[in-house]
C-alpha cells in the first residue's frame, strides 16, 4: 500500500503519457487521478511502466471501483490484467466477446492461469451457455479448453457449437467428456451424408454406443486404428469379427500391432477363435 502524500507542484497528471514512467510510486499515487486513469486505460499499454508502477495504477482503480471494474475499463486493461487476482476478476461482469479476446491476447502463449480460468468461467456463466463464437475464441487460444471442462459444464454446450470444435480440441478429453459431447455432435452433423458425416463425427466417437458403431460398419467408413483405440470398451465388446472387419476396412490389419492393448485386447479375448482366424492375422483369443 502506498502512503497518501500531496502531489508536488506542477506534477499533477493532465493525461496518461510517457512522462509518468519517471514518477516514483508515491508520485503516481498522489498525482494521477483514478478517474483520468479509467478513461485513458487504453494508453497504459503503450507506456513501459515497471511492475511496481503498475501495482500503483491497479491500486488506484481498486479504490475507484471497489465493487469491480466496469467493462469499459476491463476491455483496455492490457498487461494490467496480469496483475489481477481471481478474487478481483470474480467481481467483474464481462459480456463482450471483444473484451474476452483482448484479455486472452495478453496471456497468449502461456498456459491457462487461474486468472484466465476465472475470467472464462465468469464470461460463460454470464452468457448461460458456450455458444459457437465463444467456443471458437476459447479453443483458438487454448486448444485443450473443451477437455478442461467437467461433464456437467459440457452439458451446457449447445449442439450448434460443436461445429467450432476441431479434432485437436478433443485430444485430452476423457471418456466421460466424450460421452457428453458425442450425442451433441451426432445431432449437429445429422444432416450430412455418409462420408462427410464420418469425417466430422470421427473425433467424437470415443463416446459412441455399440449400435452406432454397428451402423457405421455398414457404411464403408474405413476407420483408422487410432480412432478405434479411442472407442469405449463397452461399445467395442459386443461387435462381431465381421462388424469390426467392415468398420476398419483395409485398416483391419492394424489389429495385430494393437493386440496387447485396450480395447483391442478385450475385444479379441471375447471372440471365438474360429471367427478371429477368418481375419488371417494370427490373433489369439
Amino acid at each position: 500500500e502506498v502512503e497518501k502524500t500531496a502531489c508536488p507542484s506542477g506534477k499533477k497528471a493532465r493525461e496518461i503519457d510517457e512522462s509518468l514512467i519517471f514518477y516514483k510510486k508515491w508520485e503516481l499515487e498522489a498525482c494521477v487521478d483514478a478517474a483520468l486513469l479509467a478513461t485513458q486505460m487504453d494508453r497504459v499499454n503503450a507506456i513501459p511502466f515497471t511492475y511496481e508502477q503498475l501495482d500503483v495504477l491497479k491500486h488506484k482503480l481498486d479504490e475507484l471501483y471497489p465493487q469491480g471494474y466496469p467493462e469499459s475499463v476491463i476491455q483496455h486493461l492490457g498487461y494490467l490484467f496480469l496483475k489481477m487476482s481471481p478474487e478481483d476478476i470474480r467481481k467483474w461482469n464481462v459480456t463482450s466477446l471483444e473484451t474476452l479476446k483482448a484479455l486472452l491476447e495478453v496471456n497468449k502463449g502461456h498456459e491457462m492461469s487461474p486468472q484466465v480460468a476465472t475470467l472464462i468461467d465468469r464470461f460463460v456463466k454470464g452468457r448461460g451457455q458456450l455458444d459457437k463464437d465463444t467456443l471458437d475464441t476459447l479453443t483458438a487460444f487454448y486448444p485443450g479448453y473443451l477437455c478442461s471442462l467437467s461433464p456437467e459444464e459440457l452439458s451446457s454446450v449447445p449442439p450448434s457449437s460443436i461445429w467450432a470444435v476441431r479434432p485437436q480440441d478433443l485430444d485430452t478429453c476423457d471418456p466421460r467428456q466424450l460421452d457428453v459431447l458425442y450425442p451433441k455432435a451426432r445431432l449437429a452433423f445429422q444432416n450430412m451424408n455418409g462420408s462427410e458425416y464420418f469425417v466430422k463425427i470421427q473425433s467424437f466417437l470415443g463416446g459412441a454406443p455399440t449400435e452406432d458403431l454397428k451402423a457405421l460398419s455398414q457404411q464403408n467408413v474405413s476407420m483408422d486404428l487410432a480412432t478405434f483405440m479411442k472407442l469405449r470398451t463397452d461399445a467395442v465388446l459386443p461387435l462381431t469379427v465381421a462388424e469390426v472387419q467392415k468398420l476398419l476396412g483395409p485398416h483391419v490389419e492394424g489389429l495385430k500391432a494393437e493386440e496387447r492393448h485396450r480395447p483391442v485386447r478385450d475385444w479379441i479375448l471375447r471372440q471365438r477363435q474360429d471367427d478371429l482366424d477368418t481375419l488371417g492375422l494370427g490373433l489369439q483369443g
Epitope: 476423457d174 466421460r176 465388446l237 496387447r260 485396450r262 479375448l269 489369439q284 483369443g285
Partner: antibody, heavy 119, light 107 residues
C-alpha cells in the same frame, strides 16, 4: 454380490510349487465382461500383478513370471487357480485373487492369503 | 513393460487438507488408469477407474484426472479414514503394472 475367497497352503518349501484356489460366490466365473486375476504383495512392498484368465481358458501372464505361472479355470466349480513353480523366498507374499471388470478395474478382491516360502 | 512412477512416495497431511498424488506412465496409456486405496492388513479398494470415473460407493471428495502419461488423484478434503497407501495401475498394456504407492500419513 460377488465375493472371492483364496485357499491353499500358507507354507511352501523352496523349489516346490505354490498352489492356490479362488472360489467365486454370488456370481459366475463365466461372466462376459470379467477376467480373473492373481495379484501378490511381498511384506512391506507394493502390488505385483501375476496374470489373469477368462472363462474360455484364455490367459495373460506377467512376462517376468510367465515361465513359472499357470492359471486355470473350472467353470463347473466356479473357481480359478494359480500354480507358481520353483518358488524361492522372493515369492513370499500375500496373494490376492481379484475380479477385473473390463469397464472398470479390479473392483472385487479376496481378503488375501499369506504364503511363506521357507524350508 | 510400462513403468508407473508415483510421487511422492509418502506425504504427511492434516484432516481437511487438499491432497494431490501424481502418477506418470513411461508411455501413453490413453485413459486406462485406475487408483486404489489400501489400508494395513486389508485388500486394496478401487477408487477411480478410466482415469476420472468414480467407482460406485466412493466418496465424491476423491477425483482423478489426466490422460496419456500424466495422471492425478486428488482428495479435496482429507478425512481421518483416508490415511492409507494409494496405488495407480495401468491396464492399457496386457502386462498390467502398478505404481510404487504413496503413503498418506497424519501430520
Amino acid at each position: 454380490q460377488v465375493q472371492l475367497q483364496e485357499s491353499g497352503p500358507g507354507l511352501v518349501k523352496p523349489s516346490e510349487t505354490l498352489s492356490l484356489t479362488c472360489t467365486v460366490s454370488g456370481g459366475s466365473v463365466s461372466s462376459f465382461t470379467d477376467t480373473w486375476s492373481w495379484i501378490r504383495q511381498p511384506p512391506g512392498k507394493g502390488l505385483e500383478w501375476i496374470g489373469y484368465i477368462y472363462y474360455s481358458g484364455s490367459t495373460n501372464y506377467n512376462p517376468s513370471l510367465k515361465s513359472r505361472v499357470t492359471i486355470s479355470v473350472d467353470t463347473s466349480k466356479n473357481q480359478f487357480s494359480l500354480k507358481l513353480s520353483s518358488v524361492t523366498a522372493a515369492d513370499t507374499a500375500v496373494y490376492y485373487c481379484a475380479r477385473e471388470d473390463a469397464l472398470t478395474g479390479f473392483d472385487i478382491w479376496g481378503q488375501g492369503t499369506m504364503v511363506t516360502v521357507s524350508s | 513393460d510400462i513403468q508407473m512412477t508415483q510421487s511422492p512416495s509418502s506425504l504427511s497431511a492434516s484432516v481437511g487438507d487438499r491432497v494431490t498424488i501424481t502418477c506418470r506412465a513411461s508411455q501413453s496409456i490413453s485413459s486406462y488408469l485406475n487408483w486404489y486405496q489400501q489400508k494395513p492388513g486389508k485388500a486394496p479398494k478401487l477408487l477411480i477407474y478410466a482415469a476420472s470415473s468414480l467407482q460406485s460407493g466412493v466418496p465424491s471428495r476423491f477425483s482423478g484426472s489426466g490422460s496419456g502419461t500424466d495422471f492425478t488423484l486428488t482428495i479435496s478434503s482429507l478425512q481421518p479414514e483416508d490415511f492409507a497407501t494409494y496405488y495407480c495401475q495401468q491396464s492399457y498394456d496386457a502386462s498390467y503394472t502398478f505404481g510404487g504407492g504413496t503413503k498418506v500419513e497424519i501430520k
